[in-house]
Interface confidence: low
């Protein structure tokens, strides 16, 4: 007898993993044998669609390799012309292990800005996303949050946020890990320790110290009165992202010294500055404070002037007396730029013997000042014109007073060799006798204020007499 179709096993919800096989069964009893058709989301599945296999007279629908897009409602309809067509429907739920569709990438960011590391995922059930920093799970806080999308957002990035990150997508079917990415936090250059201002004596050594940090580690440059530092030695060291720069200066003039720390962020630079002033206290002459020691002269400037292996007084008010006094001679000499050939050797002799004074060793090493007569000989005979010009400039403030005090002693304050021949030092390079004074060109029309011929003659001392003086 003809029998209308009855579906004996209604379709059920089928869970299937991507790339696996999924089968719907639609068992039908009827006579004659029915025609069975299948739809997905109300669209007919064609018999020749190679993605499907329809068997058992149409009662089995097999999806040969499930895709994410196969999700939907599947219905079978049976009709044999007896009675009406019957239908049963079931859902295909495509289950999917987590998959990271937009993984995080390396990020460089400036401290204080917002960083977002993407991590977009797919999966069914929907994966939960967490993040690992280094080897540890990342804890969210007021600054750090995992967004709905799975991306990691860090507000007000701090340098401690730098490191290696990876995202983890997890559902009941499995876990997916992104590759490890690097968050680099760049930090604007910042000065941690600024140079400090100093008030020092002329000719002192001063070390200005500037410490800066930043990521990348900044470079430090020094500016002196608005220009690149022209003299002085710079020592730098870098440790734990801190750069330490020390500028050692030999102070001959006041100045404003600026430490500039610079680092680069992409195409842009950040800088931090700090300044220190160096001012010069009133120069006190070395004789006033006889703290020092005797040592053989080992410098260069005064080699030709001082006796070979001369024992000179080195003033310990300087950090490095030898170098400081040597530089003082250089500096003082440069202040007296244009001098005549007659004056030059005499002035050099005076200068060298004034700065590198002869030293009397003993329990307390003592500097021996130049004898007044020799000082006056330079002032009123060899360098009369130059001396006048220099004194005039000093009075008009064109020379700094400390330079004046430094480069030329005040003759009147020096001991006379007639008081105590051992209390003062001679200038052997000023070898001449009074008979030969006329061989020198007249230097001034004014009468010398001292009886220069009172200098010892060859008959009265060991001071050699010659119309010439050799200085190279």
């Amino acid at each position: 007898l003809p029998k209308a179709p009855v579906i004996t096993t209604p379709l059920e919800t089928v869970d299937a993993l991507v790339e696996e096989v999924a089968t719907f069964m639609c068992a039908v009893e009827s006579y004659p044998q029915p025609e069975i058709s299948w739809t997905r989301n109300k669209i007919l599945i064609k018999l020749f669609d190679t993605r499907y296999s329809i068997r058992e007279n149409g009662q089995l629908l097999t999806i040969l390799s499930v895709e994410d897009s196969d999700d939907g409602i599947y219905c079978c309809t049976a009709n044999n012309g007896v009675g009406g067509a019957v239908e049963s429907c079931g859902a295909l739920q495509v289950k999917m292990k987590p998959k990271i569709t937009r993984p995080p990438i390396n990020v460089k960011i400036i401290e204080g800005l917002k960083a977002v590391l993407p991590c977009t995922t797919m999966g069914n059930p929907k994966p939960s996303v967490s993040w690992i920093k280094g080897d540890s799970p990342l804890r969210e806080n007021s600054r750090i949050a995992v967004l709905e999308s799975g991306s990691l957002r860090i507000h007000n990035v701090q340098k401690e946020d730098a490191g290696q990150y990876r995202c983890v997508a997890k559902n009941s079917l499995g876990t997916a890990y992104s590759k490890v990415v690097k968050l680099e936090v760049e930090v604007f250059a910042r000065i941690l320790r600024a140079p400090e201002s100093h008030n020092v004596t002329f000719g002192s050594f001063v070390t200005l110290h500037c410490t800066a940090t930043g990521i990348p580690v900044p470079t430090i440059t020094w500016i002196e009165n608005g220009n690149a530092v022209s003299s002085g030695s710079i020592q730098e060291s870098v440790k734990d992202r801190v750069i330490d720069s020390r500028l050692q200066l030999f102070i001959t003039k006041p100045g404003l010294y600026t430490c500039i720390a610079t680092n680069k962020h992409g195409e842009k630079f950040s800088t931090a500055k700090a300044a220190a002033t160096i001012s010069i206290a009133e120069w006190s002459k070395p004789q006033k404070d006889n703290k020092g020691y005797c040592a053989q002269y080992r410098g260069e400037v005064c080699n030709a002037v001082l006796a070979k292996d001369a024992l000179v007084f080195l003033n310990t008010s300087y950090a490095d007396p030898e170098e400081a006094q040597e530089l003082l001679v250089h500096t003082a000499w440069n202040e007296l730029k244009v001098v005549s050939p007659v004056c030059r050797p005499a002035a050099e002799a005076l200068l060298c013997n004034h700065i590198f004074q002869e030293c009397s060793p003993g329990v307390v090493p003592t500097p021996i000042p130049i004898c007044r007569e020799y000082c006056l000989a330079v002032k009123e005979l060899f360098c009369a014109k130059e001396w006048l010009v220099m004194e005039e400039k000093t009075h008009r403030g064109l020379y700094r007073s400390e330079m004046h005090l430094l480069s030329v002693p005040e003759c009147s304050k020096l001991p006379s060799m007639h008081w105590d021949p051992t209390a003062c030092a001679r200038l052997p390079h000023l070898d001449y006798n009074k008979e030969n004074l006329k061989t020198f060109p007249p230097m001034t029309s004014s009468k010398p204020s001292v009886d220069i011929p009172n200098l010892p003659s060859s008959s009265s001392s060991s001071f050699s007499v010659s119309p010439t003086y050799s200085m190279t």
């Epitope: 910042r190 941690l192 600024a194 201002s197 100093h198 404003l256 002033t277």
Partner: antibody, heavy 121, light 112 residues
Framework: ELQLVESGGGLVQPGGSLRLSCAAS????????MSWVRQAPGKGLEWVSA????????YYKESVKGRFTISRDNAKKTLYLQMNSLKSEDTAVYYC??????????????WGQGTLVTVSS | QAVVTQEPSLSVSPGGTVTLTCGLS?????????PDWYQQTPGQAPRTLIY???SRHSGVPSRFSGSISGNKAALTITGAQPEDEADYYC????????????FGGGTKLTVL
């Protein structure tokens, strides 16, 4: 959130000693110089002492030199002020303050709430 | 030893402008003194307003500005608000040695 919390204040007799502590949080402690500033009751602020980021040098107001010692423990994120031979004129609220680090003795850009030191017999 | 000087008290009307100054008993204030300004309301810890002459600390309203004028450092409040009534201290960096950082005696500002 940046925080500086002072402790260790109290009543002490003249000639006595106290050690103040300042616990820092919310910033990279070893990146910054620190200072102690005090304020006598009803009076103005007075800088007492400073220490740079690495503790490499220390600075003091003339009147406390030789009696007070500033120090820091970067691992513990703590600043200290050891006060010996206390005098009645040291009575004040002592503030711990973070230096900006940009210049020597730069601006004190964060302050604690202070701890009261009373020197009295 | 140099003393940092400030006006003991000043007053300003709400919305008005007032300038507080900070000088040295001997000599001029220069940028090398890195003038800093602090505000303190009764019972509270001080708060940083201006550092290094003219840099405003984070969170400080733009009505506060710093400068060096003549031989003094100056703090100007443009458009004073009632909440600006407080004690204001300037501090100067005095260079090496002791008493490196010196506060002024403070100015009591009243907003009438």
């Amino acid at each position: 959130e940046l925080q500086l919390v002072e402790s260790g204040g109290g009543l002490v007799q003249p000639g006595g000693s106290l050690r103040l502590s300042c616990a820092a949080s919310g910033f990279t402690f070893d990146d910054y110089g620190m200072s102690w500033v005090r304020q006598a009751p009803g009076k103005g602020l007075e800088w007492v002492s400073a220490i740079p980021w690495n503790g490499g040098s220390t600075y003091y107001k003339e009147s406390v030199k030789g009696r007070f010692t500033i120090s820091r423990d970067n691992a513990k994120k703590t600043l200290y002020l050891q006060m010996n031979s206390l005098k009645s004129e040291d009575t004040a609220v002592y503030y711990c303050a973070k230096r900006s680090g940009r210049i020597a003795f730069g601006a004190l850009d964060a302050w604690g709430q202070g701890t009261l030191v009373t020197v009295s017999s | 030893q140099a003393v940092v000087t400030q006006e003991p008290s000043l007053s300003v009307s709400p919305g008005g402008t007032v300038t507080l100054t900070c000088g040295l008993s001997s000599g001029s204030v220069t940028s090398s003194n890195y003038p800093d300004w602090y505000q303190q309301t009764p019972g509270q810890a001080p708060r940083t307003l201006i550092y290094t002459t003219n840099s405003r600390h984070s969170g400080v309203p733009s009505r506060f500005s710093g400068s060096i004028s003549g031989n003094k450092a100056a703090l100007t409040i443009t458009g004073a608000q009632p909440e600006d009534e407080a004690d204001y201290y300037c501090a100067l960096y005095m260079g090496g040695g002791s008493n490196v950082y010196v506060f002024g005696g403070g100015t009591k500002l009243t907003v009438l």
